[in-house]
């Protein structure tokens, strides 16, 4: 006999189910975006669901397959790149990840005119980076840390550099620290607009200390991974920039671009390169103490075959209250006159805004202004400037796209996205075709993401590119948590927070609270974006309230908040999380005996310090791959915010801000410490030192390591990680399994 409890309501609510951990780990509710691979003003390429590479012409409405899935499959290609003259396609296979952006791969060149792979003078393998010239079908590639050039795919290569050496000299690709903390790319070479010149960086890591860690693998003996990795205060890579004429590469060879004198006088970084014309290039440099940046515009001297960077074309950007720029120093977007440019930097009120620079930075014309921030300049045409900001309705965690008509006076501003799908879409990015003839808008939420195509002149929507219909249908019977974004005003500081509430949330009841924290300088956690993830599950199924708080040091709310943490990491970020928790308790629906905090990376550092704050607020917490001392982290990142770990600079705060210094304070909390042993970014050393300090202090704690896993803890480790953390939290909150 099967006894069925009677259904009280046969309503829709009863047919709906909560999220499960399995849903999250399987990626059941992941979404798709559509970024056209633009190849002209009105054409783009896209890889179809069945893996054909299809060319779409917006104006004719026609589309055709330029590369079949059969050809892709013949070499197991996972990526492709069409040459600008449309004669060849490179096919990328044997993808092998290195660091965050870098990977090696095997490349095959397919000739579209005869439908065959190019034979003879094949590319070596594995290649570290490969790209077409912007015009025609020249190829530049990096192999074994040296740069090679091919005039045509079938031609023999011309070797540009010869000094490349593993872990010593890097040509055309960045070393570890430049890749992760400065360029945020896998490449360090740049073609001029018409392919006449090729600029590249050479990084000399000869004197950099090496981080060495074991990679256990399956062999009898573990391998040792060695990475030149400058930690705070250590010797840094030495960088040089060269430019070679690709038409006559052997004529004068690579010519070095001079470094501005005020930069070269002490340790410095190269931060970015922007080509303006074929004979004008813009380089950005940064002092090692990262509050002074110099933008240098250099011209080709035909008579000497050299690059000249006159002092009159050096523009200095300096911060007196923090570091230069936001996370990175912004890059210029040049005007059609090929000398003046638009750039985002702090205005006199301490908000990042678009400025127009012609002769000097002092004479810059401010284009946007207000108590909000311009975030990205997408495109400048003869009559329009497209940018994103968080101006609309004063929500810092939104992103809308704006157009300023700069072809007339006074320039008029129009929000392109603010009212398109107001409830569904409040966080956009955009992708523009040549001359901004058309553009794609990609909306990330707060509703289900949607990608649309628009006319660049009228802003009219032409078509939906991706609307995630399957996801929408799949979510119809899911009890998703409720989300709200609000702010707390505390001591002249605005703390924005996102609260994720259980589906049947009742303000009169008490709920366990989990704080999810990142909190790193120039980060933002409170964003109006769609996500169905682990914390969604914790709210939906386990009845937790989850909160994310953007405290001091976070971005897009002005320099006062951003630079508050300058030279003082680990203080205000933690204070603001604690302040927010106290405010949440005052709201009346939080069970103050069941409050936890968790974070990853910088968030692991903040969660550890919050647990060790001695406030008694937190019952338990988790730190995944935390930084434990700023002396252990990368120079470029750490020194930007902390200065140098020297007596005459900021050593005292380096020492005071470690997790180890607070080992005693972990005695009254449940602490779960997690780290991958092959973390190239935040080294396992960080957690090893926390564990050692806790053991030495005879403090009990829980720990989990993931063998041979990096900072991302991917693959099967992800499933294990979230399952483990779920058990830990449920135990902490006394929730039954």
């Amino acid at each position: 006999i099967v006894l069925r409890p009677p259904r009280v309501h046969n309503s829709e609510e009863n047919t709906m189910r909560a999220l499960t951990l399995k849903d999250i780990l399987n990626g059941t509710f992941s979404y798709k975006t559509f970024f056209p691979n633009w190849i002209s003003g009105q054409e783009y390429l896209h890889q179809s669901a069945d893996n054909n590479i299809v060319l779409y012409n917006i104006e004719t409405g026609q589309s055709y397959t330029i590369l079949s899935n059969r050809t892709m499959k013949s070499v197991n290609a996972s990526n492709y790149g069409l040459s600008p003259d449309r004669q060849f396609v490179y096919l990328e296979s044997d993808y092998s990840k290195l660091w965050r952006y870098s990977y090696t791969a095997t490349y095959y060149i397919y000739d579209l005119s005869n439908g065959e792979f190019v034979r003879g003078n094949e590319l070596p393998r594995p290649i570290q980076y490969l790209c077409w010239s912007p015009v025609g079908s020249k190829l530049a590639y990096v192999y074994q840390n040296n740069i090679y050039l091919k005039q045509r795919p079938g031609d023999p290569p011309f070797q540009i550099t010869f000094n490349g050496r593993e872990n010593k000299i890097f040509n055309g690709i960045p070393d570890w620290v430049y890749e992760e903390e400065m360029l945020a790319t896998k490449y360090a070479l740049w073609w001029s607009p018409n392919g006449k010149f090729l600029a590249y960086a050479e990084f000399n890591d000869t004197d950099i200390p090496v981080i060495a860690y074991s990679y256990y693998g399956d062999e009898q003996y573990p391998r040792t991974i060695n990475i030149p990795y400058p930690k705070a205060g250590a010797k840094n890579p030495f960088v040089r920039i060269f430019i070679i004429d690709t038409t006559y590469p052997a004529y004068v060879g690579p010519q070095e671009v001079p470094v501005p004198a005020m930069i070269a006088s002490s340790d410095y970084y190269f931060s970015w390169l922007t080509w303006v014309t074929d004979e004008r290039v813009c380089l950005q440099w940064l002092k090692r103490v990262q509050n002074v940046s110099v933008l240098s515009i250099c011209d080709f001297r035909e008579d000497w075959q050299t690059w000249d960077c006159p002092k009159t074309q050096e523009h200095i950007e300096e911060s007196r209250t923090g570091w230069a720029g936001g996370f990175f120093v912004s890059t210029p977007v040049f005007s059609y006159d090929a000398i003046s440019y638009y750039k985002i930097f702090s205005d006199k009120d301490g908000y990042k805004h678009i400025h127009y620079i012609k002769d000097t930075v002092e004479n810059a014309i401010q284009i946007t202004s207000g108590k909000w921030e311009a975030i990205n300049i997408f495109r400048v045409t003869q009559d329009s400037l497209f940018y994103s900001s968080n101006e609309f309705e004063d929500y810092p965690g939104r992103r809308n796209i704006y157009r300023i008509s700069i072809g007339s006076y006074p320039p008029s501003k129009k929000c392109v996205t603010c009212h398109l799908r107001k409830e569904r879409c409040q966080y956009y990015t955009a992708s523009f075709s040549d001359y901004a003839k058309y553009y794609a808008l990609v909306c990330y939420g707060p509703g289900i993401p949607i990608s649309t195509l628009h006319d660049g002149r009228t802003d009219q929507e032409i078509k939906i590119l991706e609307e995630n219909k399957e996801l929408e249908n799949a979510l119809k019977n899911i009890q998703l948590p409720k989300e709200e974004i609000k702010k707390l005003e505390v001591d002249e500081i605005t703390l924005w927070y996102k609260m994720i509430l259980p589906p049947q949330f009742d303000r009169s009841k008490k709920y366990p609270l989990l704080i999810q924290v990142y909190g790193g300088p120039c980060s933002q956690s409170v964003r109006s974006v769609f996500a169905v993830n682990w914390i969604s599950y914790l709210a939906s199924k386990e009845g937790m309230v989850i909160a994310l708080v953007d405290g001091r040091g976070t971005a897009f709310q002005g320099d006062k908040l951003l630079y508050a943490v300058y030279r003082k990491l680990g203080v205000y970020e933690v204070e603001d999380q604690i302040t927010a928790v106290r405010k949440f308790i005052e709201m009346g629906f939080i069970d103050e005996k069941r409050i936890a905090i968790w974070g990853w990376s910088y968030g692991g550092y903040v969660s550890s310090l919050a647990l060790a704050s001695g406030t008694g607020l937190f019952k338990c917490g988790i730190a995944v791959a935390p930084v434990s001392s700023w002396e252990y982290y990368a120079s470029v990142y750490t020194e930007r915010f902390m200065g140098l770990p020297t007596k005459d600079d900021n050593l005292e705060h380096y020492k005071n801000s470690t997790v180890m210094a607070r080992a005693e304070y972990f005695r009254n909390v449940d602490y779960l410490l997690i780290h991958g042993t092959a973390d190239d970014n935040v080294h396992f050393q960080n957690s090893a030192q926390i564990a050692k300090a806790l053991v030495n202090a005879q403090v009990d704690f829980q720990a989990m390591w993931y063998s041979d896993q990096n900072h991302g803890l991917s693959g099967l480790s992800t499933n294990h990680l979230y399952t483990h953390m779920t058990h830990f939290l449920k135990q902490c909150f006394s929730l039954s399994d």
Epitope: S335, Y336, D337, K358
Partner: antibody, heavy 122, light 107 residues
Framework: EVQLLESGGGLVQPGGSLKLSCAAS????????MSWVRQAPGKGLEWIGE????????NYTPSLKDKFIISRDNAKNTLYLQMTKVRSEDTALYYC???????????????WGQGTTVTVSS | ELQMTQSPASLSASVGETVTITCRAS??????LAWYQQKQGKSPQLLVY???TLADGVPSRFSGSGSGTQYSLKINSLQPEDFGSYYC?????????FGGGTKLEIK
């Protein structure tokens, strides 16, 4: 039809002050950058300074920065040049000029007044 | 402060001739240059801006050229109404100085 009409010139003693006006008509004055230029008898043109549409930016030639003040009243469609501490070398024909916005952020002097004469003499 | 050096200071030419006036800047002005014509007793008139763009209503016999620090104004097939003084002016950085002028007289 665009018109710029200067007035206020005349004889002034060394060390004295004078305020020149430039009345604009025939165009949207409040969206134009405006400039003052002078021409000493038998000599070339000398740029004095400029003012942007909302008066938030005023630029001067360095040698005149401390004695001349450029201002505008958009409600009255009028540009002003306040001259102080004048000397004999300030004797000149004073022109006001305005012009089109040229992308990017640059203004030419398309329209000129007929000028007003300032004579500095004791 | 950028200096503008104009040459020649004066020149005589006949109707129908072609003349070229040059202007040298003491620094790179990146094509931010205008040319003006001023007739005796009259206000200056804009001829060329952005170094080579003719202002509205200016006859096509006038043409501007140059880059960097060197610029020139060319008048093809001189007409009687072209005689007068010519001035260059840069718009690169304030102060926007003028050249000393070139007086073009009928031969």
């Amino acid at each position: 039809e665009v018109q710029l009409l200067e007035s206020g010139g005349g004889l002034v003693q060394p060390g004295g002050s004078l305020k020149l006006s430039c009345a604009a008509s025939g165009f949207d004055f409040s969206t134009y950058w405006m400039s003052w230029v002078r021409q000493a008898p038998g000599k070339g043109l000398e740029w004095i300074g400029e003012i942007n549409p909302d008066s938030s930016t005023v630029n001067y030639t360095p040698s005149l920065k401390d004695k001349f003040i450029i201002s505008r009243d958009n409600a009255k469609n009028t540009l002003y040049l306040q001259m102080t501490k004048v000397r004999s070398e300030d004797t000149a024909l004073y022109y006001c000029a305005g012009g089109y916005y040229r992308y990017p952020y640059y203004y030419t002097m398309d329209y000129w007044g007929q000028g007003t004469t300032v004579t500095v003499s004791s | 402060e950028l200096q503008m050096t104009q040459s020649p200071a004066s020149l005589s030419a006949s109707v129908g001739e072609t003349v070229t006036i040059t202007c040298r800047a003491s620094g790179n002005i990146h094509n931010y240059l205008a040319w003006y014509q001023q007739k005796q007793g009259k206000s200056p008139q804009l001829l060329v801006y952005n170094a080579k763009t003719l202002a509205d209503g200016v006859p096509s016999r006038f043409s501007g050229s140059g880059s960097g620090t060197q610029y020139s104004l060319k008048i093809n097939s001189l007409q009687p109404e072209d005689f007068g003084s010519y001035y260059c002016q840069h718009f690169w950085s304030t102060p926007y100085t003028f050249g000393g002028g070139t007086k073009l007289e009928i031969k």
